[in-house]
C-alpha cells in the first residue's frame, strides 16, 4: 500500500511540476522591469524566452517575437534548450510512469518490468527537473550580471549625468514557476525511485517451496511470517525478501473484480 | 462614435470644494484610463493625474495630489475629479480625456471652466 | 519632471509654405523594449479641447491629413506640416507619455502672415 502511495503521488507531484515547467517556458515574465529606484514610467517591459513585450499604462500590450535565431544571445539559447530538453524527459517520464503505475494493469506484466519502467520515469523526472532549475538559474544568473552592469552604466557618463534612464531587468514570475515546478519535478522522480525499490523484488538464497493440496495452493516461506493464498494452481516460485513485516504491495497481488485491465 | 461629456461650468468661492464630472459614451467604461488635464487662460497643459474606471487604481501629478480626487462610478458610468480648497490659482479650464496606445489621449471632453471668486 | 521645451513659440507662415517645429525632451522617451519613442503631437484651437494629431512620436492619428509628419528620437522631435493650410493655425503641444507625471511643452503658434 506504501508503495503504491508513494508511486502514486511521485506521479502526481511530477505531473504538476512538468505542468509548471511547461508553463513556465511558454511565460513572457521571465524577466520584468525593475520598478525599485528608478523613474516611474508609463511603460512597462516583460521578456520571456520566446518574446519580448510592452504594456502600456492604457493598456495596450505590444509583444515581439525573437525572430532571429543567430542573433540571440547563447545563454538565452542554452536556457531554451535547457527547458525544452527538461519538457521532453518530463513528457516521456509521464508517459512511461503511467504503465508503470501498480493500480494500472496491462496484460500479464511483470512486477519486475514495472520496478524497472518506475525507476526509468524516476530518472527522467529527476534529469528534467535538474534541466529546468538548471535552466531557469542560468537565466537568473544572466539577469543579475546584466543588473549590475546597467546600474554601474546608470551612473556614468558625462559628468555623472544620466543622458538616458537605462531598462533595468529583475526576476519575472516564470523564474520562480520554474524553480517550484523543477523543484516538484525532482521530488516526484526522487519518490518514484524510492517506489521502485518497493515494486522490485530482492534476490535472496532462499526460494519459496510450493505444497499442493487439492482445491488451493498454499506457499510455505521459510521465515513463516506470511504465507499467501491465490486462485488455482501457482507453481511459480516466488521470491522472499529477508524476513520482517511486509505490506500488501510487497506480496504477489492476483487480479481481482477489483483490478484495471 | 466616442464621446466625452462632461459637467457645466461653475462658479466657487475661495477655500471650498468642487466636483467636475466626465461621462464617456461610444465605448467601454472600463477599458481605458482617463486623464484630467488643466490648462489656465491662455496658459499651456498640466497633467493632473489618471485614474483605471475598471479597478479604480488612480496615479497622480505629485504637484496636485493634495488637490485633486479622481473617482469613477462604474455604475453610472462616470469620472469624477474633486477639487478642494480651491485659490484663484484653480481657475482654469478642466479637460477630461480617454488614454490610448501610446499613452496619448485621442478623445477629450469639451472643457469645465472653474472659476474660484470671492 | 521631465522638462519639454518647444520651439520656437511662435511662428509667422505663410498658406503652402512648408513648416517645422521643434520638440527637445530632458530626457530620453524611447523605449529599449518596443524601440518606441513615447512622444505625442496634438493641435489646440481657440475654445476647443486638444487634438492629438502623431503618438509614437511618428505614427499618424487616423483622420489626420498626411501633411503633418511626426519624426526624431530620443530627445529631440520635429513635427513638419508639408503645405500648411489656413485651417492648420493653431497651437501645437508636445507631450511626454513615457515618464510620470506626463508633461507638456509650451507650445508653438502657428499664425498666419
Known amino acids: 500500500m506504501a508503495v503504491t502511495a508513494c508511486q502514486g503521488l511521485g506521479f502526481v507531484v511530477s505531473l504538476i511540476g512538468i505542468a509548471g515547467i511547461i508553463a513556465a517556458t511558454c511565460m513572457d515574465q521571465w524577466s520584468t522591469q525593475d520598478l525599485y529606484n528608478n523613474p516611474v514610467t508609463a511603460v512597462f517591459n516583460y521578456q520571456g524566452l520566446w518574446r519580448s513585450c510592452v504594456r502600456e499604462s492604457s493598456g495596450f500590450t505590444e509583444c515581439r517575437g525573437y525572430f532571429t535565431l543567430l542573433g540571440l544571445p547563447a545563454m538565452l539559447q542554452a536556457v531554451r534548450a535547457l527547458m525544452i530538453v527538461g519538457i521532453v524527459l518530463g513528457a516521456i517520464g509521464l508517459l512511461v510512469s503511467i504503465f508503470a503505475l501498480k493500480c494500472i494493469r496491462i496484460g500479464s506484466m511483470e512486477d519486475s518490468a514495472k520496478a524497472n519502467m518506475t525507476l526509468t520515469s524516476g530518472i527522467m523526472f529527476i534529469v528534467s527537473g535538474l534541466c529546468a532549475i538548471a535552466g531557469v538559474s542560468v537565466f537568473a544568473n544572466m539577469l543579475v550580471t546584466n543588473f549590475w552592469m546597467s546600474t554601474a552604466n546608470m551612473y556614468t557618463g558625462m559628468g555623472g549625468m544620466v543622458q538616458t534612464v537605462q531598462t533595468r531587468y529583475t526576476f519575472g514570475a516564470a523564474l520562480f514557476v520554474g524553480w517550484v515546478a523543477g523543484g516538484l519535478t525532482l521530488i516526484g522522480g526522487v519518490m518514484m525511485c524510492i517506489a521502485c525499490r518497493g515494486l522490485a523484488p530482492e534476490e535472496t538464497n532462499y526460494k519459496a517451496v510450493s505444497y499442493h493440496a487439492s482445491g488451493h495452493s498454499v506457499a510455505y516461506k521459510p521465515g513463516g511470517f506470511k504465507a499467501s493464498t491465490g486462485f488455482g494452481s501457482n507453481t511459480k516460485n516466488k521470491k522472499i525478501y529477508d524476513g520482517g513485516a511486509r505490506t500488501e504491495d510487497e506480496v504477489q497481488s492476483y487480479p481481482s473484480k477489483h483490478d484495471y485491465v | 462614435q466616442v464621446q466625452l461629456q462632461q459637467s457645466g461650468r461653475e462658479v466657487v468661492r475661495p477655500g471650498t470644494s468642487v466636483k467636475v464630472s466626465c461621462k464617456p459614451s461610444?465605448?467601454?467604461?472600463?477599458?481605458?484610463?482617463i486623464d484630467w488635464v488643466k490648462q489656465r487662460p491662455g496658459q499651456g497643459l498640466e497633467w493632473i493625474g489618471g485614474i483605471n474606471p475598471g479597478s479604480g487604481d488612480t496615479v497622480y501629478n505629485e504637484k496636485f495630489k493634495a488637490k485633486a480626487t479622481l473617482t469613477a462610478d462604474k455604475s453610472s458610468m462616470t469620472a469624477n475629479m474633486q477639487l478642494s480648497s480651491l485659490t484663484s490659482d484653480d481657475s482654469a479650464v478642466y479637460f477630461c480625456?480617454?488614454?490610448?496606445?501610446?499613452?496619448?489621449?485621442?478623445?477629450w471632453g469639451q472643457g469645465t471652466l472653474v472659476t474660484v471668486s470671492a | 519632471d521631465i522638462v519639454m521645451s518647444q520651439s520656437p513659440s511662435s511662428l509667422t507662415v505663410t498658406a503652402g509654405e512648408k513648416v517645422t517645429m521643434s520638440c527637445k525632451s530632458s530626457?530620453?522617451?524611447?523605449?529599449?523594449?518596443?524601440?518606441?519613442?513615447?512622444l505625442t503631437w496634438y493641435q489646440q484651437k481657440p475654445g476647443q479641447p486638444p487634438k492629438l494629431l502623431i503618438y509614437w512620436a511618428s505614427t499618424r492619428e487616423s483622420g489626420v491629413p498626411d501633411r503633418f509628419t511626426g519624426s526624431g528620437s530620443g530627445k529631440d522631435f520635429t513635427l513638419t506640416i508639408s503645405s500648411v493650410q489656413a485651417e492648420d493655425l493653431a497651437l501645437y503641444y508636445c507631450q511626454n507619455n513615457y515618464f510620470y507625471p506626463l508633461t507638456f511643452g509650451a507650445g508653438t503658434k502657428l499664425e498666419l502672415k
Open positions: 530626457q530620453s522617451l524611447l523605449n529599449s523594449g518596443n524601440q518606441k519613442n513615447y
Open positions: 480625456a480617454r488614454r490610448v496606445r501610446g499613452n496619448s489621449f485621442d478623445s
Open positions: 461610444g465605448y467601454a467604461f472600463t477599458n481605458y484610463l
